[in-house]
Interface confidence: low
Amino acid sequence: TQHGIRLPLRSGLGGAPLGLRLPRETDEEPEEPGRRGSFVEMVDNLRGKSGQGYYVEMTVGSPPQTLNILVDTGSSNFAVGAAPHPFLHRYYQRQLSSTYRDLRKGVYVPYTQGKWEGELGTDLVSIPHGPNVTVRANIAAITESDKFFINGSNWEGILGLAYAEIARPDDSLEPFFDSLVKQTHVPNLFSLQLCGAGFPLNQSEVLASVGGSMIIGGIDHSLYTGSLWYTPIRREWYYEVIIVRVEINGQDLKMDCKEYNYDKSIVDSGTTNLRLPKKVFEAAVKSIKAASSTEKFPDGFWLGEQLVCWQAGTTPWNIFPVISLYLMGEVTNQSFRITILPQQYLRPVEDVATSQDDCYKFAISQSSTGTVMGAVIMEGFYVVFDRARKRIGFAVSACHVHDEFRTAAVEGPFVTLDMEDCGYNIPQTDESTLMT
């Protein structure tokens, strides 16, 4: 959840044990979730764009207060604006909710380029275009923030969908999705289809546009083509996965696969870019530059700082290579690959000075905290967060942007040996300073 190149967050919240609990084995595996009925009421329930985040409408409190909430698989707190702010059009008013309960505890979440702080409580929460249930969930009421809310983004809070281990202030604060699964019969799984527009959206277009779907408790087969391929969740904190090989236009980067996962690789809907560890980023950019050498771009472009523009409709997609990430498969010595197009990693932006042109930012950037498969990756795929089976599924998204020559792809199986060696083991001492 990165800011600028990152969206705001990078930590989270969750919840103290709650009394409201329906009898249900929380580790019960759902049936093949897509067969449990129609999810039509959840299709198209997201809005937004990759640069400012995708959000879902939620209601909090009694009577219900409606808020737009950023969907963030890279953090674990449900946190909402609870005081006026120049970038908020509405906010959560605890004193107007008859069901609000104060936990008499504060929370402070610093991150690389800013922070938010607030007061912890619980209240009744539901998702109008989600499952027909109401849960009592932990809420961080944000009373102070710096460089967190984004002007024009149209969201007022954040839904951290990762695991309790990275919740703030500590892992005793139960995350929203854990509360949802405990208190209802919703299967322990959700899936995301993020739909990049492929062209810059102005403010009114973003408000009017469909941004995608969050299917809570299942899989909707209409949202993808081909087969779903699953990679194991390595550890339940972030949604951590293992990358075993990287190719640019089919050419192997030929790096020790540990480098790809140094110090981790995560799937994060709250991050804009594909972020790569320093060495991997340098090698990837070198290879992408070589592949696209028919045109020369300023250094600032490759650093994500400068736009490149072409006359409307003339973007030379064909000179840019496809990028393939090979992920560990569910079967021993088997992997599969996901392939994205330049239409995913060149992010359309509005350039006021040259509004007749199509302008883009390079949406691959350097990371000091491992690989982050952010919105530019996720916009190519339908991604299933199968928490019950501790795995993440990828299929080609029915809404991904492509051209007549190439399409995003999910393909396999490939034989890959010693994949376990690709994972990096973070020293215990490092974990206490996680993502501040």
Epitope: A83, P84, P86, L88, H89, R90, Y91
Partner: antibody, heavy 120, light 108 residues
Framework: QLQLQESGPGLVKPSETLSLTCTVS??????????WSWIRQPPGKGLEWIGS???????YYNPSLKGRVTISVDTSKNQFSLKLSSVTAADTAVYYC????????????WGRGTLVTVSS | EIVLTQSPATLSLSPGERATLSCRAS??????LAWYQQKPGQAPRLLIY???KRATGIPARFSGSGSGTDFTLTISSLEPEDFAVYYC??????????FGGGTKVEIK
């Protein structure tokens, strides 16, 4: 029933500092969901937002007045205050204090207003 | 800064008639617009927020509509107490919070 009441001198000399206080009664100024604001209205003219303050002291000001305006809060007295420096006749107006409420950014509760005249 | 332009400046009508007041924004403010009523010697009072939602205690004869740049406040049947000045205000982007110049509804 929450009420707001402005107080302060009705006459200020040019180049001096205008000082007003808004007292909140019937409820606490500390409720975290509210911003407290100042708005003014020159005689016979429209409304102009001056600025807002949150209980922590965080402030937002109208850029057209920035540099001259200071809003502060005293939670122990349940009051917030406005100071406008280097006043001229153009600052003559009815000054209102107001609360931002409704879980949104509109002014849902207003004081009755106090007329401040800038004149020597 | 977003500029709000209200029209007409003055509206002369009789009690029982329908009043239609317009507010136009210099750029889109989505639905983040409010209407206030101000009577002589009194503070403004919030009537409508989020373009179309009536504030607490506001009679049903007041309604708001519009989104983007064009908004309308309608008073379906004017009561004697409705003759006043009406202001629109946007909070789509602030600071500053901006108001329109006002429309005076007077008795014909």
């Amino acid at each position: 029933q929450l009420q707001l009441q402005e107080s302060g001198p009705g006459l200020v000399k040019p180049s001096e500092t205008l000082s007003l206080t808004c007292t909140v009664s019937g409820g606490s100024i500390s409720w975290s969901s509210y911003y407290w604001s100042w708005i003014r209205q020159p005689p016979g003219k429209g409304l102009e937002w001056i600025g807002s303050i949150y209980r922590s002291g965080r402030t937002y000001y109208n850029p057209s007045l920035k540099g001259r305006v200071t809003i502060s809060v005293d939670t122990s007295k349940n009051q917030f205050s406005l100071k406008l420096s280097s006043v001229t006749a153009a600052d003559t107006a009815v000054y209102y204090c107001a609360r931002v409420g409704h879980g949104i950014n509109y002014f849902d509760l207003w004081g009755r207003g106090t007329l401040v005249t800038v004149s020597s | 800064e977003i500029v709000l332009t209200q029209s007409p400046a003055t509206l002369s009508l009789s009690p029982g008639e329908r009043a239609t007041l317009s507010c136009r924004a210099s750029q889109s403010v989505s639905s983040y617009l409010a209407w206030y009523q101000q009577k002589p010697g009194q503070a403004p009072r919030l009537l409508i927020y989020d373009a179309s939602k009536r504030a607490t205690g506001i009679p049903a004869r007041f309604s708001g509509s519009g989104s983007g740049t064009d908004f309308t406040l309608t008073i379906s049947s004017l009561e004697p107490e409705d003759f006043a000045v009406y202001y629109c205000q946007q909070v789509y982007t602030w600071p500053p919070r901006t108001f329109g110049g006002g429309t005076k509804v007077e008795i014909k």
